[in-house]
Amino acid sequence: HHHHHHEQKLISEEDLGGEQKLISEEDLRAPRCRELPAQKWWHTGALYRIGDLQAFQGHGAGNLAAPISGLKGRLDYLSSLKVKGLVLGPIHKNQKDDVAQTDLLQIDPNFGSKEDFDSLLQSAKKKSIRVILDLTPNYRGENSWFSTQVDTVATKVKDALEFWLQAGVDGFQVRDIENLKDASSFLAEWQNITKGFSEDRLLIAGTNSSDLQQILSLLESNKDLLLTSSYLSDSGSTGEHTKSLVTQYLNATGNRWCSWSLSQARLLTSFLPAQLLRLYQLMLFTLPGTPVFSYGDEIGLDAAALPGQPMEAPVMLWDESSFPDIPGAVSANMTVKGQSEDPGSLLSLFRRLSDQRSKERSLLHGDFHAFSAGPGLFSYIRHWDQNERFLVVLNFGDVGLSAGLQASDLPASASLPAKADLLLSTQPGREEGSPLELERLKLEPHEGLLLRFPYAA
């Protein structure tokens, strides 16, 4: 029997004719336990993208170790984020726009050596962090796929998949696939190579597109492909629009496993004002699918706040000396060190959400039901069988308002209780663990609530 966390009751000897036995409430109630879905590792938590190893490592006082070795020293940090996989690079040799000088089998010495990489893989494995390698070929150039030499490049990718699978990587990412001619058929072929090696290997494709039809056509012939896109960044950050985008996507893809992010590579701060970062973290961690973040999303890293830093690869702010050129530009509350010490920080919220996402059945693989609520709100329930259930209410608006939850939208299997316990709020000031009356629920501007309630027969 699957290990759901059912209430256990001790039945007395008299009840059982002299034999003492543990029987769960579920057995008394009779309905059988719902069959658990097969879950791959990428279903169990977030992925963390490190597109630029040098920026992630930080420069200045950290620039002398090869960035791949430096990353090995940061695995404990990644473990503390409870992320399940690391999407790394690209790190291969690529001379801008030169196919002949692009070698997907060779690591650019700027990042380290093959030995450094092998050592990273071993260390990551020990910590149960999977490593996904980005093989986007011309990552330094104008067109990521050298538009004129598609077949040459496709052959290089095929060879690279086989080489790196043998080397022990857990999956691959290719980005900007809107620039790849016949992307669907190439992706199908690369997917076959990846899955042919092991069903436990993952292929991620990224596109800049936000168009649902284009996204669906890419997914059509690739059933297990994980696709990152700019789909959600088109929401205009309103509750109604976000709700319709999410529900449309889930309906159109037949509820197949998907990923959630705002883009294929960029930071959340590229799209969102600071006041919505917490709300989006809560949403990305609680939608059905794999949340995908970029390094720095957990602290609200924002290139615009760091004069002279490249938008696409701002330096990771480990502490106040990570951006040393302008004294005072970085305050403690912008850094990993500062936020780690503050239970009310964005980083602390990220860690809590990631922890919940990786251990609660309803969030791991539960059903999803969105339902109507007040203007500017997006609310939904996650539930799985007789496990604890979760209610998410998100206020995208600039004004506080009543939740106005319309429970009548929900199927009988997912009905709302009168009260639910507050697990967390994205805003300070609420007492966590306290029961909230759902009919009288009010939300602050930009507030998101995560509430829990038990299954009731």
Partner: antibody, heavy 125, light 108 residues
């Protein structure tokens, strides 16, 4: 702006030690390694090693192992290079230097951009 | 360690002329990590080129760098009076960081 200001010229006897200081300003001192280099009269530049002001970690080239000690005092944003058992062929100008971070063509780059004015150490009996 | 050999040792040219300085490495250097410096008597070195071909902030465009692997070149397209100095190449891709012995560009 970034400035590295070194201590003044020194004259030392063979066998003695010299301690050269390098005071940093215009940036957060703990954010960048301080590198030390030397240049004998009429000769080329020779890199001696570095100190990480954040942690105090050091790395010296083989040639100077056992004779050089690099330290720092973060409270006054100053790095020090101590060279012991001086010989006459240690007569040189000693420089402290710091990298500048450039982002170019998708790669971060770290050349030595900021230099102290140099400290002449003369070893003579 | 990587040994850098500069040639010629001395280059005698007139203002307005083109100067081509060479730097050869004993083993391949990541072109991202090769720099050129200018040094005048009594002064600290000044960074001209980093990453083999990128000009440092404030360096005039008459200075250009090229090359990869083991062969690198610094070119000064039209020598100005203030360009007469000693030029050093340096690799900072593998420890220990090393410099060439220098090329002196003097007025003919």
């Amino acid at each position: 702006q970034v400035q590295l200001v070194q201590s003044g010229a020194e004259v030392k006897r063979p066998g003695a030690s010299v301690k050269v200081s390098c005071k940093a300003s215009g940036y957060i001192f703990t954010g960048y390694y301080i590198h030390w280099l030397r240049q004998a009269p009429g000769q080329g530049l020779e890199w001696m090693g570095w100190i990480n002001p954040n942690s105090g970690d050091t790395n010296y080239i083989q040639k100077f192992q056992g004779r050089v000690t690099m330290t720092r005092d973060t409270s006054i944003s100053t790095a020090y290079m101590d060279l012991s058992r001086l010989r006459s062929d240690d007569t040189a100008v000693f420089y402290c230097a710091r990298i500048q971070v450039y982002y170019d063509g998708g790669i971060y780059n770290y050349p030595l951009h900021h230099w102290g004015q140099g400290t002449l150490v003369t070893v003579s009996s | 360690e990587i040994v850098l050999t500069q040639s010629p040792g001395t280059l005698s040219l007139s203002p307005g002329e083109r100067a081509t300085l060479s730097c050869r490495a004993s083993q391949s250097v990541s072109s991202s990590y090769l720099a050129w410096y200018q040094q005048k008597p009594g002064q600290a070195p000044r960074l001209l080129i980093y990453g083999a071909s990128s000009r440092a902030t404030g360096i005039p465009d008459r200075f250009s760098g090229s090359g990869s692997g083991t062969d690198f070149t610094l070119t000064i397209s039209r020598l100005e009076p203030e360009d007469f100095a000693v030029y050093y190449c340096q690799q900072y891709g593998s420890s220990p960081w090393t410099f060439g012995q220098g090329t002196k560009v003097e007025i003919k």
